[in-house]
Structures are given as C-alpha cells and as structure tokens.
Interface confidence: low
C-alpha cells in the first residue's frame, strides 16, 4: 500500500487539515483548567489529572490510552518539621529564619497542598557553620576560590546563586569542595529583569519568590533505586545508601529578600571580580564567614524532608499506523508540577493535548497516519526525569527496535521573542522546511514565515541566512530516548532574546508565581506563540509519521562532525608538547569524519532515486535513516556514566541542561594539566578518540549500500 | 552470603605506620559505601572512617581523632577497603571493624596494637 | 559531636522475662539510629536500624522504637543467647558516634 492509499487524501492536504485544526482559544482553555490546582507528583491531585487526560484522549478518538504506574523514589518536606536556615549567635540562639513559604499569589490565598520551596532529596541535617559565597557555584568558579584565592570551603556552608548551569552540578560541586551544606538563592541580577515589576503586577520574580527543583546528579539512572531497570511490582530496590546520585550535603533555596540577611553580613574576601557580583545592595564577600561585629554568628540549616518510595503514573495514547504500525513516533512531555505549572510544564501539557485533538479529529474522518504515533503525558519529570525514564526502561526492546523520533513537549513558552529549536542533526532540515510552511506570530513579521522571524532574531553562528538550532543536552523528558536509546529527539518552544535579557531561564521558574495569569497577562495573552508551537511540534510530529521517506538527513549530521572534532582537536592542541610526548593523534577521527561524508553523501543520491513504490526497498532505506541515530550509541556508555551512551552528543559534566558534543574527549581533556598522572590522562584521550573514530565509521557503514 | 573478612593487624611501634586490608564478597561491592569502624575496651566503639561509592565521587569521611593520619581507599575491581595509618599512638589500639553501610554487615576484625 | 548515652550500663534478667533498653542522643537525630548485638568473641551484628526498622533475619521478639532524642529497644521474652552487650549507634551526621554499651546478664 502506498501512503495516499492509506490515509484517502493526500499528504500535504491531510498537514493541512491537520495544521488548521489546531486553535489558540483551545490550548487557552486547556491551560487554565491544568493549573487551577497543584499537582506534584506522587499526589491524588495528579492521579485525577492523568485520569483526567486519559479519559479526554479516549473523547479525542486516540486507539487506546493506558496509564502505566511506578514506584519511585520522590522527595517531600516534613509537614510538621519545615525546612529554614537561620543565623544564630554565639549562645546558639536563632537571630534570624528564612521564611517558611512564598506569600500565595492574588486569587490562590485559600489553595491547600502549595508545597513549600524545598531541594528535592536533600538528605535531612542542620549543619551549622561559617558561609562562603561560590557564585554560581561552577567548576569554573570552584577553580576561583581554591586555586586563586586559596579558600577552603571544606566543612563550610556555602551559599550560590541560581543560573547558568543545571542546580544538581552546583550541589555535585560544592560536595566534592568539602561543604557541609548549600544554599541555593535567586539573585536579582539573575531573575529580575530590569524595567519590568515583579509579580502580580509584572513577570518578575518578588523578593519572596523562590526556585524549587531536585538536586540529583543521576545521569539518565531514572529512579534512584532501580537504574536500569523499570520501578515495577517486582523490582528489585537498592537501599537508599545505594541510591544513585542523591545529594550527601543538606541543601535548601531561598529568595533573594533572604539571601539580602546572609549575605550583607558576610566578609572575608572581596568578590574576585566584577562577574561574581550581582544587583542585591550586598558587598558579594566570599568570606568565610560573617565580618567584624557578627563574626561569632554562624548560619545553622534545618532540613527535615524525606525520601519516600511512592507511585507515580504516565498516560500513554496510541493512534496505530496504518501502513507501518511497528514504527513509532513518539510526542511526550511532562504533566507534574511543582505548583501551578502555569509555563512548566502545563503551557507544554496544554499544546500536546490540542495536538491529540487534532489528530484525533482527522482520525475520525476516516484518516491515520502511515506509522504509530504515540502520546505521552509523563510524571515526575521534575523528581529527575523518572515517569519517561521508567517507561522507557519497561519498553527498551520495543523502542531500540520501533523508535523513529521522539519530540519533547516541555513548556512551550520561556519569553515571546522567538524560536528555539534544540535537535538531532537529522531533523535540521525538517525544521527549516516545517517552519518555511508556518506564518510567524511576530510584530513586525505579518505575512512572513516563522523560518524568516526566527533566522532574523536568531541567527545560526555558522551559517548566514539560517537559523540557529541548538545540541540537545539534558534536563528534560528526551533524555532516556536520545542519550540512552539512540532515538532522533527534538524539541522547540518560544524564548526570550537572549541578547537583551541575560537572566537565566524565566524569573518566575519553580515559583508558586507561575500561574495561569502569569501566561494570559504578560506572556502570551492571544495564545498566539502557544499555537505557533503547536504547529511546530505537530508538525515534526505529522511529517515524522507520515512521510513515505523519513524527513531525515544524513548529510547534516556529516556537517556536524566535521564542526565538532575540529573543535576537540582545537581543544586538545592547547597542550601540543603533551600531543607530541604522547603520540596523540585525531587523524583516525577525521578519516571516520571523512569517511562518514562521503558516504552519506551516496546514501541521499540513492535516497533521490529509488523505488519508492517499491515497500521492501522502502522500508530498508527507511530503517537506515531511523538506526542512523542508533548506530551513534556505545553499549558501554560514557566513562562513569553508563546511561550516557550517544558517543556524539551528552550533557555536560559541568551542566546537565548544556549538550556537549565528543563528550568523552571532552571530558578525557578537561583540566588534563592538573592531573597527578599525566601518562594516564593522555591516554585516556587517545582511548576516547579510538571510541569515537570507531563510532563514527561504524555509524557510517550502517549506511553503505547492503549488499 | 555477604561476608567481610579484614587481615593485616599487628603489632607496630609509635610513630610507625600499617595498613589493613578488608575483602568483601556476596554482594555487589562497588555499589557500597564502606566504613572502618574500631573498638576498645576502654572507650567502645568509634567510628574512624568512611569512604562512598563510585557515583559519590568516592567521597571520604573521617573522624576527628584520626583526621590526617589515616587514609580510607578501596578498590571496586578487588572488592577491597583499605586503612593507611600513619604516625600510630597507644591510643589507636583496637580491633578494626571493617562494615558495609549503614553499619549492616561487620567483619570479624583485625587487632591493631600501637606499643614500644 | 553527637554524644549517645545508653542506660542501664548492665541489667541482669531470667530467660521468658521482657527486657527494655534506652538510648539517649545529646541532639535530635531524628530515626537514623541502629541497635547492635555483640557477643563475647565476636563482631557486632545489627540488630534494628532506622529506629524501629528490624534488620534481616532478626527474631521478631525485637524491637525498636523512638525518633529524635530518647530511643528504645525491647526484647518481648528474653532467650539465653541475648544475654550479650548491646549498643546503639547514630548515622545522622558525622562522625557516626555509638553509645557505650548495655551488657545484659543472667539474673
């Protein structure tokens, strides 16, 4: 059967249809029912919802939606033993307590079960000791402190402010520094943008608002007592000493109102530098410990949360393939906040459930796609990505088998400037011809394409007149697909210019602030952004299951690894004596690079000319493009990081939510001057260039003519 | 069966140096975190060390009392846990508990006696 | 540091009588506290941990019981062979300190 056979009307008609059935006023009136209440995961409030959706997608007209359930490991304050630091004196008295809640937003006075900020899965503790400010508490900064500045924060508390680099690789940091505990604040200069008022009245973030969010360095483990393996009846649970990735060192956010008490006492060292300063009326002294008069006060923490073993529940939504039902797109994004959600994540929720409702319609005119398209509402991504890691982990065989793409559907909104695209190489050229077909939503750009919008306020670096489209790193729901399983994964969303606004990610993140009217009132109040990202996400999503030939190509990603192993090579000749001593050599890299070009090269002439009528050629032409990405995986993964496996791409070891690219180079390199063995290190880099020079032409030949 | 059996104890003068050894097995060694733990019949028992897993960046912990004159290390690949002392005193003399976390399993011991 | 006071030093009683001992943390521990057995040659073993939690394949005549400062550990019907040392031991911050024992004797 052909494509048009099985779907009775014609490909771009049915993305037509499909694209025109996607309206604003919907995904306005989803969201607002998403975030009326709470819904953390592991509580009813969140069984209703998934209940809630199940039985709407079934409305919709999708074959069939199950909620498949775990247990987990989450993490949740002590009701009747709340979490604060204090600054005590020299008797031990508390002189000063951070609060114990954010004041509710107007309208959400009377909400029960708001959880208070917290750190998920600090461990439980009161610490007491000096403070010593580390920034943004990066490697980078660490490196600051103890080798320039020659401070010790062993046995110390420290304190960071929030940004630039994913909070677990913060608390990861400060541990392996010595602290005996951490403190996490928002700093104005970070989430307050200048010129705008904070919340109610404007999209910053207020003195008493604060950042909720886990704290784990699993590295794609997925529940920390089952890595590998689903958290299912039968599973077999490590002892929580065994766990993987929890924090050691109490930790606990505050707001910057807070953060003002503990840091305007602080002395010590002067800040090194003017980065190390942000906009609170504060000296930014390192310290340790407090200046002059308050020497004798230390800050004491009291952390009482638990770790608790509790069920959790994805909704999971099939539409079966008419023609190649054993292929799987897969659309998924989180459904768990830890308030509101009002951006994150239910501004995601709401367009994946208007996506349902338009596939859903076509469907019951008698429509399907050529291959399965799986939705998926997940839980506790916010607990360390574990609803989607778990079911990933129950249906690794399926997937690493059926898996053509995954898109993620996280917020679809972080500011209303334009696009941002994170993706495989194979999906660039997908994205830019979707994005050709769209209009943009933008002032100033009626009448013309989102591809012309975003290429303007976003320009790709490299290449003139393209957009920019970023490495995917980690942080979200794609993780388990790319990283560990070797499916092509995408996503995209509305963002902020980056150029103007430096503050990391949106002010009001985490917050109990992040509300409905946060998103109708200062984001997006015509729900056009929101829709022009359904159209996106819908979009990949159609073409992915519906092309006769995948809408990937191969060539993009030879572009790439040209772009990357000049770039580790660059890196890596920072140090040519230590090349030299060490016969380091990349030329085994860029032969595979080389190699890999010209062969995909051949592959997409073939690609051009076969017989396209023909369903066994098709198809095998097909599986080369869907296990391209696969072939990219190592079964023994990344140096201590076994679930990190993509040899081309991983989130930082300095930055969970960064992508870094040759990842095992990369790390093989990284401070290599400071290591005690130098011999050792050198060859640590030659065995990871071997890795992926061997990756890469393997990968290669996965697209050679079979015979 | 998970067994811990510790072996290197001795006699040794003040000042002197020894290192004791601890081999696990019945049970995936790498995953644990390991103490050193000792006992005398004057002050019971003292925890002297602790070091944690691979995916806790092997930190190490250690009592006050021994604090910069021992060193926790293991090695996963031999299912060990070793303690280097160095510049021993009478005080330190006791049986050497070699446990899994927290504190579960115990080895036998091995006696460490610091005297001229 | 954490200071753990057990009480009594030593108690002496009959085999089938019920035996109570207590531990006293100088600071909120919170149930991160563990019961231990020692017999006389021998290394301790753990008998409860997580305050009231009972470790594998210990009889079910012990128990524990307690959270923050003051906890208990009871034996129902007291056996010839408890008639050992006991200590308690906290892992709630470093160091991990243990009481001074309990020795129970043959009354």
């Known amino acids: 059967k052909s494509s048009n056979e099985a779907t009775n009307i014609t490909p771009k008609h049915n993305m037509k249809a499909f694209l025109d059935e996607l309206k604003a006023e919907n995904i306005k009136k989803f969201l607002y029912n998403f975030t009326q209440i709470p819904h953390l995961a592991g509580t009813e409030q969140n069984f209703q919802l998934a209940k809630q959706i199940q039985s709407q997608w079934k409305e919709f007209g999708l074959d069939s939606v199950e909620l498949a359930h775990y247990d987990v490991l989450l993490s949740y304050p002590n009701k009747t033993h709340p979490n604060y630091i204090s600054i005590i004196n020299e008797d031990g008295n508390e002189i000063f307590n951070t609060s114990l809640f954010e004041p509710p937003p107007p309208g959400y006075e009377n909400v029960s079960d708001i959880v208070p900020p917290f750190s998920a899965f600090s461990p439980q503790g009161m610490p007491e000791g000096d403070l010593v400010y580390v920034n943004y508490a990066r490697t980078e900064d660490f490196f600051k402190l103890e080798r320039d500045m020659k401070i010790n924060c062993s046995g110390k508390i420290v304190i960071a402010r929030y940004g630039k680099v994913f909070r677990g690789n913060k608390v990861k940091n400060a541990q392996l520094a010595g602290a005996k505990g951490v403190i996490l604040y928002s700093d104005p200069a970070d989430y307050f943008a200048p010129g705008v008022k904070s919340y109610p009245d404007g999209w910053n973030l207020p003195g008493g608002g604060v950042q909720r969010g886990n704290i784990l360095n699993l590295n794609g483990a997925g529940d920390p007592l089952t890595p590998g393996y689903p958290a299912n009846e039968y599973a077999y649970r490590r002892g929580i000493a065994e766990a993987v990735g929890l924090p050691s060192i109490p930790v606990h956010p505050i707001g910057y109102y807070d953060a003002q008490k503990l840091l305007e006492k602080m002395g010590g060292s002067a800040p090194p530098d003017s980065s190390w300063r942000g906009s609170l009326k504060v000296p930014y002294n390192v310290g340790p410990g407090f200046t002059g008069n308050f020497s004798t006060q230390k800050v004491k923490m009291h952390i009482h949360s638990t770790n608790e073993v509790t069920r959790i529940y994805n909704v999971i939504g099939t539409l079966r393939g008419a023609v190649e039902p054993d292929r799987y797109v897969i659309l998924g994004g989180h459904r768990d906040s830890w308030v509101f959600g009002g951006i994150d994540p239910q501004s995601g929720a709401a367009v994946v459930h208007e996506i349902v409702r338009s596939f859903g319609t076509l469907k019951k005119e008698g429509w399907r796609p050529r291959r399965t398209i799986l939705f998926a509402s997940w839980d506790a991504e916010e607990f360390g990505l574990l609803g989607s890691t778990e079911w990933a982990e129950e249906n690794s065989r399926l997937l690493q088998e059926r898996g053509v793409a995954y898109i993620n559907a996280d917020s679809s909104i972080e500011g209303n400037y334009t696009l941002r695209v994170d993706c495989t190489p194979l999906m660039y050229s997908l994205v830019h011809n979707l994005t050709k077909e769209l209009k943009s939503p933008d002032e100033g750009f009626e009448g013309k394409s989102l591809y012309e919008s975003w290429t303007k306020k976003s320009p790709s670096p490299e290449f003139s007149g393209m957009p920019r489209i970023s490495k995917l790193g980690s942080g979200n729901d794609f993780e388990v697909f790319f990283q560990r399983l070797g499916i092509a994964s995408g996503r995209a969303r509305y963002t902020k210019n980056w150029e103007t606004n430096k503050f990391s990610g949106y002010p009001l993140y985490h917050s109990v602030y992040e509300t409905y009217e946060l998103v109708e009132k200062f984001y997006d109040p015509m729900f056009k952004y929101h829709l022009t990202v359904a159209q996106v996400r819908g979009g990949m999503v159609f073409e992915l299951a519906n092309s006769i030939v995948l809408p990937f190509d191969c060539r993009d990603y030879a572009v790439v690894l040209r772009k990357y192993a000049d770039k580790i090579y660059s890196i890596s000749m920072k140090h040519p004596q230590e090349m030299k001593t060490y016969s380091v050599s990349f030329d085994s890299l860029f032969s595979a690079v080389k190699n890999f070009t010209e062969i995909a090269s051949k592959f997409s002439e073939r690609l051009q000319d076969f017989d396209k009528s023909n369903p066994i050629v098709l198809r095998m032409m097909n599986d080369q493009l869907m296990f391209l990405e696969r072939a990219f995986i190592d079964p023994l993964g990344l140096p201590d990081r076994p679930f990190y496996r993509h040899v081309i791409y991983a989130p930082s070891s300095h930055n969970k939510y960064a992508g870094e690219s040759f990842p095992g180079i990369y790390d093989a390199l990284f401070d290599i001057e400071s290591k005690v063995d130098p011999s050792k290190a050198w060859g640590e880099v030659k065995r990871q260039i071997y890795v992926a020079a061997f990756t890469v032409q393997a990968a290669a030949e996965t697209l050679s003519e079979v015979a | 069966e998970v067994k811990l059996e510790e072996s290197g104890g001795g006699l040794v003068q003040p000042g002197g140096s020894m290192k004791i050894s601890c081999v696990a097995s019945?049970?995936?060694?790498?995953?644990?975190?390991m103490n050193w733990v000792r006992q005398t019949p004057e002050k019971g028992l003292e925890w002297v060390a602790e070091?944690?897993?691979?995916?806790?960046?092997?930190?190490?912990h250690y009592a006050e009392s021994v604090k910069g004159r021992v060193i926790i290390s293991r090695d996963d690949s031999k299912s060990s846990v070793y303690l280097q002392m160095n510049s021993l005193r009478a005080e330190d003399t006791a049986v050497y508990y070699c446990?899994?976390?927290?504190?579960?399993?115990w080895g036998q011991g091995t006696t460490v006696t610091v005297s001229s | 540091n954490i200071v753990m006071t057990q009480s009594p030093k030593s108690m002496s009683a009959s085999a089938g009588e019920r035996m109570t001992l207590t531990c006293k943390a100088s600071e909120n521990v919170g149930t991160y506290v563990s019961w231990y057995q020692q017999k006389p040659t021998q290394s301790p073993k753990m008998l409860i941990y997580g305050a009231s939690n009972r470790f594998t394949g210990v009889p079910d005549r012990f128990s524990g019981s307690g959270s923050g400062t003051d906890f208990i550990l009871t034996a129902s019907s007291v056996q010839a062979e408890d008639l050992v040392d006991y200590y308690c031991g906290q892992s709630y911050t470093f160091p991990y300190t243990f009481g001074g024992g309990t020795k129970l004797e043959m009354k």
């Open positions: 019945g049970f995936t060694f790498s995953n644990y975190w």
């Open positions: 446990t899994r976390r927290w504190n579960n399993f």
């Open positions: 070091i944690r897993s691979q995916s806790n960046n092997f930190a190490t």
